[in-house]
């Protein structure tokens, strides 16, 4: 899909299985042409997406894409949930699909499950 609109490359119904206590970077890949748009992260609360204020964010530049990164330092059990990034471009708001963090609280897990186990059974990971 080639165009000069801003595009946010988060896959629909994507997810990440992560552990409380670990660091994690949630990336929002952003494609733009001339001027980098203002990008923000929000966390879904029901149907409302609540803007995340005062969080550590950064930009990473690659060849054809920029990444707006939300840092979790470290991941907390309360970080479980769905997140969306949005870009302000020419006074329009472009929203990404939401992506879900499934946080396993290692204190309550008897042992750390393997990535394969987590990947195939995300419904076990709700905290």
């Amino acid at each position: 899909k080639e165009s000069c609109d801003v595009q946010l490359y988060i896959k629909r119904q994507s997810y990440h299985s992560i552990f409380a206590g670990d660091p994690f970077k949630l990336e929002c890949p952003v494609k733009y042409c001339a001027h980098r748009p203002q990008v923000t992260w929000c966390k879904l609360n029901g149907t409302t997406c609540v803007k995340l204020e005062g969080r550590h964010t950064s930009w990473k530049q690659e060849k054809n894409l920029s990444f707006f990164i939300l840092h979790f330092e470290p991941v907390l059990p309360s970080d479980n949930g769905s997140y969306r990034c949005s870009a302000n471009f020419l006074s329009a708001i472009i929203e990404s699909h939401s992506t879900t963090l499934y946080v396993t609280d290692v204190k309550s897990a008897s042992e750390r499950p393997s990535k394969d186990e987590m990947a195939s059974r995300p419904w076990l990971l709700y905290s």
Partner: antibody, heavy 119, light 112 residues
Framework: EVQLQQSGAELVKPGASVKLSCTAS????????MYWVKQRPEQGLEWIGR????????RYDPKFQGKATITADTSSNTAHLQLSSLTSEDAAVYYC????????????WGAGTTVTVSS | DVVMTQAPLTLSVTIGQPASISCKSS???????????LNWLLQRPGQSPKRLIY???KLDSGVPDRFTGSGSGTDFTLKINRVEAEDLGVYYC?????????FGGGTKLEIK
């Protein structure tokens, strides 16, 4: 143009396992979801599960959990379906398909792989 | 699981005449992003399925505009305004909103 090449027909013994492959061209599979569908002779379509090749995360229909394992190798742009403990119920055509994970702009199916289970 | 129910099972149509297939889901397919992930596939005899329509009404590239998809929530329809010989095969609706993905049982379109 996005295309999928599936591996050839398989004749397997009951109780054995089989691994099918599906190689994509015309797209980087990291930008897609790849999924597998079962079709028994003269019957409808059953969704087995899908993989996000960018991170290896999978979703399965619970009825295929433990029977099917989907993996992907981004270096060869290939997805795999492994079926274990085969019985006559697993004899079917297995289709792989690929779709754009961001915009749903394409959804392309392979030609299918026939799995026959016989002693 | 979402149950997808198609009707009729078989449709016998004269070339040049219209055809209509119904697809009903047991739950709403409206996603939280405001879109409805309902697709239509055609499986021609001896071939693999091919997507015709996605997001209820969007035609895939190369699909003739005699095909139209419509509906919302739980009720969907595929219409062919003038059936051609190449349209014969089995039509499936399937939903991409909820896991696991589920297919309708199929509607076989025969040419009279």
């Amino acid at each position: 143009e996005v295309q999928l090449q599936q591996s050839g027909a398989e004749l397997v013994k009951p109780g054995a396992s089989v691994k099918l492959s599906c190689t994509a061209s015309g797209v980087n599979i990291k930008d897609t979801y790849m999924y597998w569908v079962k079709q028994r002779p003269e019957q409808g379509l059953e969704w087995i599960g899908r993989i996000d090749p960018a991170n290896g995360y999978t979703r399965y229909d619970p009825k295929f959990q433990g029977k099917a394992t989907i993996t992907a190798d981004t270096s060869s742009n290939t997805a795999h379906l492994q079926l274990s403990s085969l019985t006559s119920e697993d004899a079917a055509v297995y289709y792989c398909a690929v779709y754009d994970g961001y915009y749903e702009s394409f959804d392309v199916w392979g030609a299918g792989t026939t799995v026959t289970v016989s002693s | 699981d979402v149950v997808m129910t198609q009707a009729p099972l078989t449709l016998s149509v004269t070339i040049g005449q219209p055809a209509s297939i119904s697809c009903k889901s047991s739950q709403s397919l409206l996603d939280s992003d405001g879109k409805t992930y309902l697709n239509w596939l055609l499986q021609r005899p001896g071939q693999s399925p091919k997507r015709l329509i996605y997001l209820v009404s969007k035609l895939d590239s190369g699909v003739p505009d005699r095909f139209t998809g419509s509906g919302s929530g739980t009720d969907f329809t595929l219409k062919i305004n003038r059936v051609e010989a190449e349209d014969l095969g089995v039509y499936y609706c399937w939903q991409g909103t909820l896991f696991p993905r589920t297919f309708g049982g199929g509607t076989k379109l025969e040419i009279k």
